[in-house]
């Protein structure tokens, strides 16, 4: 015997209260597959969340974050405040990186400068709050006549595309 609910298409549910007829999903809900006995709840994008894709009767909404915030967590389940380069987010807000650390993004934590001496190299460009140090050749390579090293261009700010 075929289950009568199997005939219910996506966007509907099999309504046990109405002799298993196919009823449209109620407002703010959806079903992405046929034959469902219940509709899923649409995600709402409110507050710091912004609607990236509207909910339909057959697919869930997708959220990203309003300007000044970035997505965190699965499916952008949270929005975290952006900070400036050279800062990190703490419980008290954005704080400058401590000396000896840097952050070249608007998110994440301050990380220690690279220790060039661990690789037997010298510091070619000093670090800042926004940039890591640039390590040069080892001191032994800095003999007269050695070719000069051009430091790389500063890294571009990564785009914060929605997750």
């Amino acid at each position: 015997l075929q289950d009568p609910c199997s005939n219910c298409p996506a966007g509907t549910f099999c309504d046990n209260n109405r002799n298993q007829i196919c009823s449209p999903c109620p407002p703010n809900s959806f079903s992405s597959a046929g034959g469902q006995r219940t509709c899923d709840i649409c995600r709402q994008c409110k507050g710091v969340f912004r609607t990236r894709k509207e909910c339909s009767s057959t697919s869930n909404a997708e959220c990203d974050c309003t300007p000044g915030f970035h997505c965190l967590g699965a499916g952008c389940s949270m929005c975290e405040q952006d900070c400036k380069q050279g800062q990190e987010l703490t419980k008290k807000g954005c704080k400058d990186c401590c000396f000896g650390t840097f952050n070249d993004q608007k998110r994440g934590i301050c990380r220690p400068w690279t220790n060039c001496s661990l690789d037997g190299k010298s510091v070619l460009v000093n670090g800042t709050k926004e940039r890591d140090v640039v390590c040069g050749p080892s001191p032994a390579d800095l003999s007269p006549g050695a070719s000069s090293v051009t430091p790389p261009a500063p890294a571009r700010e990564p785009g914060h595309s929605p997750q």
């Epitope: 597959a33 899923d40 709840i41 869930n60 965190l72 967590g73 949270m78």
Partner: antibody, heavy 121, light 112 residues
């Protein structure tokens, strides 16, 4: 039709361990759902325990009562969710349900039938 | 941590009565609130989501209202099938170190 079926409950001594399973059918763990464990002690109310995102990232969240002792995980190839429970106490005695959320706000429209865990010597 | 407080804990009513159950959140949860019905030995069943949206297959005699910290579930005309325990639940994912999600203590609706 979509369903969740729990298993793995039973009698365990205090301090012991147990692993509960929640088998999903009718939908894929590659979908963007949260699946959570909720428990109910005999004659008591509902208590949220832990959640995992069964999409790609697998993010996990725990209630304070579960942190450190309970671990939520999943096996996408088996479309199954697990709750590893260690250092069990008498107060962990409850029916354990798995439940699914599509809203990201702890609203569960699909529940399993539950599995009973009894912690007693 | 988020705390949900339900009142009353028990409610005696008759078929045809209008029944109201209240739920209070310890902090502002906007409309991120759901109501469930549970019968003995069964899993909870979703009735209302986002404080006022009716879940699929739920009779229209059930309705929800409220936002922020105060919420209400109303059954306009109690039916024999409605004698059960009702739970509110509020919550949202904040961060892995601080996740909020809580059920109210439940309201048992029994026959007067």
């Amino acid at each position: 039709s979509q369903s969740l079926v729990e298993s793995g409950g039973g009698l365990v001594q205090p301090g012991g361990s147990l692993r509960l399973s929640c088998a999903a059918s009718g939908f894929s763990f590659s979908s963007n759902y949260w699946i959570c464990w909720v428990r109910q002690a005999p004659g008591k109310g509902l208590e949220w325990i832990a959640c995992i995102y069964v999409g790609s990232s697998g993010d996990t969240y725990y209630a304070s009562s579960a942190k450190g002792r309970f671990t939520i995980s999943r096996d996408n190839s088996k479309n199954t969710l697990y709750l590893q429970m260690n250092s069990l106490r008498a107060e962990d005695t409850a029916v354990y349900y798995c439940a699914r959320d599509s809203s990201s706000y702890y609203m569960f429209n699909l529940w399993g039938q539950g599995t009973l865990v009894t912690v007693s010597s | 941590a988020l705390v949900m407080t339900q009142s009353p804990s028990t409610l005696s009513a008759s078929v045809g009565d209008r029944v109201t159950i209240n739920c209070q959140a310890s902090e502002d949860i906007d409309t991120y609130l759901a109501w469930y019905q549970q019968k003995p030995g069964k899993a909870p069943k979703l009735l209302i989501f986002y404080a006022s949206d009716l879940a699929s297959g739920v009779p229209s005699r059930f309705s929800g209202s409220g936002s922020g910290t105060e919420f209400t579930l109303t059954i306009s005309s109690l039916q024999p099938d409605d004698f059960a325990t009702y739970y509110c639940q509020g919550g949202y994912y904040t961060s892995s170190a601080d996740t909020r999600g809580a059920f109210g203590g439940g309201t048992k609706v029994e026959i007067k």
